[in-house]
C-alpha cells in the first residue's frame, strides 16, 4: 500500500490528525520535499545577520552578514568581525600583524612571510604587514657571467652620432 503522505508536495505537511490530508505550511515555515509530516521553521536573519534570500514555502531563508562582518560556518551560521588588511582578529579585537607576518585579507590570521632562502632565492621586495615578500632570482643567478641572456645595448639619443 502506498503511503498517502507521499502525495503531499513540497510546501505542505501531511496532517496525521486529519486523515493524512495535505495542509499548507504556515507563514515563515517550509517543507523542501514532498511527503513530510512537519514543516521546518524558517531561519530568521536578525541582528548582525541580514537576509540574502527570503524564506518560501519550499525553501529556507539564507543569511549573510552586515557590512563590517563576514560569514563563518556552514550556511553562514556565524558572523565574525572584519579587520583591516595587516591585522588579525583576537579576543581583544583587531590587532596589527607582528613583524615578519602579514595578512592581505579582512579575515583570517597573520601568516609568516615567505622565507626566500629556503628556495635558494633572494628577497626582491620586502614584506609588509599587508603583503608577503616577493622572492627574486637566486643569488647565483645574479653573479656576473651566470646569465646566458645578452643584456640590451644602451639606447642612443636621437641626433647624436657615436663618438
Amino acid at each position: 500500500l502506498q503511503d498517502p503522505c507521499s502525495n503531499c508536495p513540497a510546501g505542505t505537511f501531511c496532517d496525521n490528525n486529519r486523515n493524512q490530508i495535505c495542509s499548507p505550511c504556515p507563514p515563515n515555515s517550509f517543507s523542501s520535499a514532498g511527503g513530510q509530516r512537519t514543516c521546518d521553521i524558517c531561519r530568521q536573519c536578525k541582528g548582525v545577520f541580514r537576509t540574502r534570500k527570503e524564506c518560501s514555502s519550499t525553501s529556507n531563508a539564507e543569511c549573510d552578514c552586515t557590512p563590517g562582518f563576514h560569514c563563518l560556518g556552514a550556511g553562514c551560521s556565524m558572523c565574525e568581525q572584519d579587520c583591516k588588511q595587516g591585522q588579525e582578529l583576537t579576543k581583544k579585537g583587531c590587532k596589527d600583524c607582528c613583524f615578519g607576518t602579514f595578512n592581505d585579507q579582512k579575515r583570517g590570521i597573520c601568516r609568516p612571510w615567505t622565507n626566500c632562502s629556503l628556495d635558494g632565492k633572494s628577497v626582491l621586495v620586502n614584506g609588509t604587514k599587508e603583503r608577503d615578500v616577493v622572492c627574486g632570482p637566486s643569488p647565483a643567478d645574479l653573479s656576473p657571467g651566470a646569465s646566458s641572456v645578452t643584456p640590451p645595448a644602451p639606447a642612443r639619443e636621437p641626433g647624436h652620432s657615436p663618438q
Epitope: F13, D15, N16, N17, C25, P26, P27, N28, S29, R37, T38, C39, D40, I41, R43, Q44
Partner: nanobody, 120 residues
Framework: EVQLLESGGGLVQPGGSLRLSCAAS????????VGWFRQAPGKERQYVGT??????HYGDFENNRFTISRDNSKNTVYLQMNSLRAEDTAVYYC???????????????QGQGTLVTVSS
C-alpha cells in the same frame, strides 16, 4: 540555556475552564514553534497542539475545547482549556521546536510541567 516554566495548573470542576501559561527564559519564542503535550497518570504522553506564526494545530482529542495563543511582548504562550472533563486530568508540558506541528516530533526543549486535576 533555554528554560520553560509552566503555571496555571490546579484543581477545577468538570465543565470548568483553566488557562495555562508558559514563559521562556534564556531565549525568546520568536524563532520557535511552541506546543503543549500532556501525560495522564499511567498513560503515554499525548500531543495537545502547536502554535506558530498565527496558526494553531491541535491533537485529535480536544474537539475545539482547547486554544493556544501567544503574547510576544510577554514572551509567554497560553493554553486555554474549556469544558474540562475528568479525562483531561494530566501533567501539561510546554515545549518548543523548529518543527510545525509537533505531533510527531521530539521537542528541542520542554518544561517541567504543571498538574491539572479535573474533579468534583
Amino acid at each position: 540555556e533555554v528554560q520553560l516554566l509552566e503555571s496555571g495548573g490546579g484543581l477545577v470542576q468538570p465543565g470548568g475552564s483553566l488557562r495555562l501559561s508558559c514563559a521562556a527564559s534564556g531565549r525568546t519564542f520568536d524563532n520557535y514553534a511552541v506546543g503543549w503535550f500532556r501525560q495522564a497518570p499511567g498513560k503515554e504522553r499525548q500531543y495537545v497542539g502547536t502554535y506558530w506564526s498565527g496558526y494553531a494545530h491541535y491533537g485529535d482529542f480536544e474537539n475545539n475545547r482547547f486554544t493556544i495563543s501567544r503574547d510576544n511582548s510577554k514572551n509567554t504562550v497560553y493554553l486555554q482549556m474549556n469544558s474540562l472533563r475528568a479525562e483531561d486530568t494530566a501533567v501539561y508540558y510546554c515545549a518548543i521546536s523548529l518543527k510545525y506541528p509537533m505531533a510527531t516530533v521530539t521537542p528541542d526543549y520542554q518544561g517541567q510541567g504543571t498538574l491539572v486535576t479535573v474533579s468534583s
